[in-house]
Interface confidence: medium
């Protein structure tokens, strides 16, 4: 079976992974919901050029995932 990652992350998910610890560090009292809200606002206010690295990484991960599935499907026959 494909050695697929647990989740295919979006550009926004990758952005959140990077900035969530920073927000928590700066605002330790914020609830999970408030952190998510702040991350959403930050993403919406991020310029298209600055979003590009995250979008590129997400596209690369999607490509890898598709290759994993393709490699699995090329393996052979039913049991």
């Amino acid at each position: 079976d494909p050695n697929a990652p647990k989740r295919l992350p979006s550009a926004f998910f990758l952005f959140c992974s990077e900035y969530r610890p920073k927000i928590k560090g700066e605002h330790p009292g914020l609830s999970i919901g408030d952190v998510a809200k702040k991350l959403g606002e930050m993403w919406n206010n991020t310029a298209a050029d600055d979003k590009q690295p995250y979008e590129k990484k997400a596209a690369k991960l999607k490509e890898k995932y598709e290759k994993d599935i393709a490699a699995y499907r090329a393996k052979g026959k039913p049991d």
């Epitope: 995932y65 393709a70 039913p78």
Partner: antibody, heavy 117, light 109 residues
Framework: EVQLLESGGGLVQPGGSLRLSCAAS????????MHWVRQAPGKGLEWVSG????????EYADSVKGRFTISRDNSKNTLYLQMNSLRAEDTATYYC??????????WGQGTLVTVSS | QSALTQPPSVSAAPRQRVTISCSGS????????VTWYQYFPGKAPKLLIY???QRPSGVPDRFSGSKSGTSASLAITGLQAEDEADYYC??????????FGGGTKLTVL
Amino acid sequence: EVQLLESGGGLVQPGGSLRLSCAASGFTFSKYIMHWVRQAPGKGLEWVSGIVPSGGLTEYADSVKGRFTISRDNSKNTLYLQMNSLRAEDTATYYCAKEIFGQFDYWGQGTLVTVSS
Amino acid sequence: QSALTQPPSVSAAPRQRVTISCSGSTSNIGNNAVTWYQYFPGKAPKLLIYSDNQRPSGVPDRFSGSKSGTSASLAITGLQAEDEADYYCQSYDRGLSVVFGGGTKLTVL
């Protein structure tokens, strides 16, 4: 013996919701990609959605994207299809199918979903 | 409209040979395996041919599959009354997506 048993079909009004289940037995469910395929009356087979063994990766046909959600519970050996904002064109027999290497080697007997007012 | 193109119907007399075509593109059949299913309405589809030309155990050798470029075909020789059914070709695209043909109704005259 491999068995796939769908349930949850029925009559629902346009705009309504249904949740289909597929109980799997006779194989190690958690190791296989699983899919939903449907056949509308008088039409051909149409792939609806697929999900990888971990459950973390899913894909949908354009016709159901944003309305249907596929999921699985490997501890219960069960595949699900949550169908929201149902339309008349979603009326079909829905089959769950086990994939191995790109083909479906086992299918359930299907459950009928009728969307009508 | 289906991603793979099949004739809606074919017919032949018992003991004759019949072929069902399936046409696709480089994104599916051209680069990926083709599978054929036999389908009796109201029943579960049955895997007939996989990996273009392989037969699962239990499928008679009267059934055979072939592929060339972006097209595939299913051949049935020594046609029998019980072969009257719907036949579907299937391949796949990128990721998890799967594509089917529109299906071909086989009538045994």
